[in-house]
Interface confidence: medium
Amino acid sequence: RTVPPMVNVTCSEVSEGNITVTCRASSFYPRNITLTWRQDGVSLSHNTQQWGDVLPDGNGTYQTWVATRIRQGEEQRFTCYMEHSGNHGTHPVPSGKVLVLQSQR
């Protein structure tokens, strides 16, 4: 079976002018997934991202996250790239509100 992830992108201010953007993937199966931040359409290097473990979420599916720190005002340059079981998608940083996107099967 394949269950596509729900992808959710959120922002939180960490200091003046700087924000942490977090991309969460949840409720997916199987557990293999690629989740990475892109800037200007290119994957960020590993040393500028933090990843969470891929963990079971209690429903027979999995969840994980990736975060990076960016400067306020450059949100439009960043997208979260997800690849899972042959499906892939890009998810922008929301402007002012949380964005929840269901990947297509």
Partner: antibody, heavy 121, light 112 residues
Framework: QVQLVESGGGLVKPGGSLRLSCAAS????????MSWIRQAPGKGLEWVSY????????YYADSVKGRFTISRDNAKNSLYLQMNSLRAEDTAVYYC??????????????WGQGTLVTVSS | DIVMTQSPLSLPVTPGEPASISCRSS???????????LYWFLQKPGQSPQILIY???NLASGVPDRFSGSGSGTAFTLKISRVEAEDVGVYYC?????????FGPGTKLEIK
Amino acid sequence: QVQLVESGGGLVKPGGSLRLSCAASGFTFSNYAMSWIRQAPGKGLEWVSYISPGGDYIYYADSVKGRFTISRDNAKNSLYLQMNSLRAEDTAVYYCTTDRRHYGSYAMDYWGQGTLVTVSS
Amino acid sequence: DIVMTQSPLSLPVTPGEPASISCRSSKSLLHSNLNTYLYWFLQKPGQSPQILIYRMSNLASGVPDRFSGSGSGTAFTLKISRVEAEDVGVYYCMQHLEYPFTFGPGTKLEIK
């Protein structure tokens, strides 16, 4: 080894058009962003345009915005710069460069030999 | 746009002696990811530019270790510990933090 070969330069009248090409080899072209940089005769370097690996992110210098169009054909390992409404101040050697700054690497680590564009009546 | 300045614009050096080039930016190039997006290039006579230093202080592949880069958010220095004849050319700093990317005017290093 990595090779970038520009072509398409030449003499053109003000208001005319040219299309520059950059043929890439020796690396997986579709994985990398690319940029065009130019250098007027006897002058310094000026960044012109950027395109992401998939062509979904494109940026231009203000001096060429609305006149120049960057594009790529990943199947042909080629980068292009369509230049319209050319002006005398566009006269320069145009270089194509790789842009690998997000791969734990760095930007502009490979440059072509350049192609000269001369805009004159 | 971020404005880049360099000094000196001309630098005559005796082979074997050290050399230092200064670069300044009108805005801090320190990103919140702690990388500083300042690059150094050398353009030898009749050649395309080549990268020397990336992200302020990292030596690019194949570049001799007599070159080094340092600095803070807005003030940067390229040092050559012992200049050799092959080091002649024009040295450019460039900010790669935000669009449009901008270069300094260049510093011409020549052998005395």
